[in-house]
Structures are given as structure tokens and as C-alpha cells.
């Protein structure tokens, strides 16, 4: 399964406004997650990409949390 296919984010930051403005700062290789509308990639190999979308929510984390690992 391609790393970029699942819309998820480990490093999401939001303003505390209602509604918020959230941005994912995860770096991914070669492409952004599947729900990203504006993806910027560095001219390197492999390309390092990040999504510059501003959303009103955070996607679920990609990595299971420590709590999830225990259960």
C-alpha cells in the first residue's frame, strides 16, 4: 500500500479559533496523502512532499499511538 494513499497526519497544528485552521506538516516521499489538494514536493530524489492545504480538522494519526500499541 502506497504511503501516500491514506489521508492521515502525525503532525497537525491548528489555530484555536472556532472553526480552526489546521495544517499538516508531515513530510512524505514522492506524494502527499490522498485527500491533499495542494501538494508541494522538493526537487530531490526521492522527492520530499508536504501538503499545504488548510483544513478545519486534523486527520487521524498515521502511526498508532503508544496507547494503541499497548491494547
Amino acid at each position: 500500500d502506497d504511503e501516500s494513499s491514506k489521508p492521515c497526519c502525525d503532525q497537525c497544528a491548528c489555530t484555536k479559533s472556532n472553526p480552526p485552521q489546521c495544517r499538516c506538516s508531515d513530510m512524505r516521499l514522492n506524494s502527499c496523502h490522498s485527500a491533499c489538494k495542494s501538494c508541494i514536493c522538493a526537487l530531490s530524489y526521492p522527492a520530499q512532499c508536504f501538503c499545504v492545504d488548510i483544513t478545519d480538522f486534523c486527520y487521524e494519526p498515521c502511526k498508532p499511538s503508544e496507547d494503541d500499541k499497548e491494547n
Epitope: C14, K16, N18, P19, P20
Partner: antibody, heavy 120, light 112 residues
Framework: EVQLQQSGAELVKPGASVKLSCTGS????????IHWLRQRPEQGLEWIGK????????EYGPKLQGKATITSDTSSNTAYLQLNSLTSEDTAVYYC?????????????WGQGTLVTVSA | DVLMSQAPLSLPVSLGDQASISCRSS???????????LEWYLQKPGQSPKLLIY???NRFSGVPDRFSGRGSGTDFTLKISRVEAEDLGVYYC?????????FGGGTKLEIK
């Protein structure tokens, strides 16, 4: 478990002030916003205002601007609502609630409410 | 201010029935970011309100799937597919798209 515990009922005289408290447990109030709302007898719900306890920033609804002051004390995980120059129109149940702004949800968890009665 | 109007004021139902509550806003409640911030709350007798639905159709955690929300623009509906005794109380819609944020006047769901 996220819980908000509010202070007890208040009976106050017209013209007086009152300060209500809302203490969080199971979460850190700095992580979200704390909102205050009220419900007057036989009436609907009304948003009063909110505070970001992480920095003390506040916002108020237009109807209670000047009457309500929201503060917080992060060391005790508590938010406060002070109401000044009370009249019988301010008789209501006052609720605090925490948002989950990153969902985004406005009023995710509510306190049990504090009844404020303004009477001579 | 955006006026939120709910209908009916009172809704008598039999347990197991479907219930439908309408909420209309006096103006379009699409936020400038393109999203619609319409929430539904249930206040049971003697309790504080509890969140059921956010952003028109998203169930909050722990809310049974018999609750569903839909709508757009100015017209919104909360449906309860099979009413249970624990669903009785007053339902409020709320809009967070335009300041000041406002609630509907409530719909009381009661036993027929």
C-alpha cells in the same frame, strides 16, 4: 473521562455581582477553549463567550459584552465567569463547556450547570 | 443575527417510530471556508445538553447510529430511525458559521 464540575447555585440581589467556577478533570483546560452559555427559564440556549486558557484570550457574544468577564487559572484547571450589575433578566442556568476545536466541535462536553437566581 | 427556527415545537412519538426534526436558518450558514457548522444537541430532563451531530452529518463519539443529520444551505434535518426511551428530551440545532453563534428554540420529543 472528560468532566466539568461547576460551582453551586447562587441567590443574588439585583445590582450585585457573582463569580461562577468550572473545574476540568480528565483533561487539561489549556488544550481547548472553555465556553460559557446560559439558559433562561423557558427559553433557549445563548452563547456568552469563551476563553483560551493557554493565553487568556477571550471572545464574547454581543448581548453580554460588558456584563460578563471570563477568566481562567490553569494551575487549578478552572475557568470563571463573573457577571456584574445583575438584573432579574440574568436569572438562568449557566453552563460551561469545552470545545474540540480540531474536530471541529463547538461544545463537546458540558458542566452540570449553575442556577443563578436574581431576586430582591 | 442568524435566526434558527425549529419545527415542530413538540413531537409526540411511539417508541420504535422514526422521528424527524427540522431546523431552518434565516440565512445560508455556509462558512467563508466552505464548510457548514450545524450541530444538534439533546437536553434530557434535568440534565445539561449533549452533543449528537456536528458539521451537519457527523455523529459525535458514542452517539448511536440511529441518529443521522442531513441538509445544506438553510434547511437541516435530524432523523432518529427508531426512537428509544432514552432519546426523549429537547433537541436543539446550533449554527457556528456566523457570529454571534445561535441556537434554535428547541423541539421536545415526547411519548405519544
Amino acid at each position: 473521562e472528560v468532566q466539568l464540575q461547576q460551582s453551586g447555585a447562587e441567590l443574588v440581589k439585583p445590582g450585585a455581582s457573582v463569580k461562577l467556577s468550572c473545574t476540568g478533570s480528565g483533561f487539561n483546560i489549556k488544550d481547548n477553549n472553555i465556553h460559557w452559555l446560559r439558559q433562561r427559564p423557558e427559553q433557549g440556549l445563548e452563547w456568552i463567550g469563551k476563553i483560551d486558557p493557554a493565553n487568556g484570550d477571550t471572545e464574547y457574544g454581543p448581548k453580554l459584552q460588558g456584563k460578563a468577564t471570563i477568566t481562567s487559572d490553569t494551575s487549578s484547571n478552572t475557568a470563571y465567569l463573573q457577571l456584574n450589575s445583575l438584573t432579574s433578566e440574568d436569572t438562568a442556568v449557566y453552563y460551561c463547556a469545552t470545545d474540540l476545536y480540531s474536530k471541529p466541535v463547538w461544545f463537546a462536553y458540558w458542566g452540570q450547570g449553575t442556577l443563578v437566581t436574581v431576586s430582591a | 443575527d442568524v435566526l434558527m427556527s425549529q419545527a415542530p415545537l413538540s413531537l409526540p412519538v411511539s417508541l420504535g417510530d422514526q422521528a424527524s426534526i427540522s431546523c431552518r436558518s434565516s440565512q445560508n450558514i455556509v462558512h467563508s471556508n466552505g464548510n457548514t457548522y450545524l450541530e444538534w444537541y439533546l437536553q434530557k430532563p434535568g440534565q445539561s445538553p449533549k452533543l449528537l451531530i456536528y458539521k451537519v452529518s457527523n455523529r459525535f463519539s458514542g452517539v448511536p447510529d440511529r441518529f443521522s443529520g442531513r441538509g445544506s444551505g438553510t434547511d437541516f434535518t435530524l432523523k432518529i430511525s427508531r426512537v428509544e426511551a432514552e432519546d426523549l428530551g429537547v433537541y436543539y440545532c446550533f449554527q457556528g458559521s456566523h457570529v454571534p453563534w445561535t441556537f434554535g428554540g428547541g423541539t421536545k420529543l415526547e411519548i405519544k
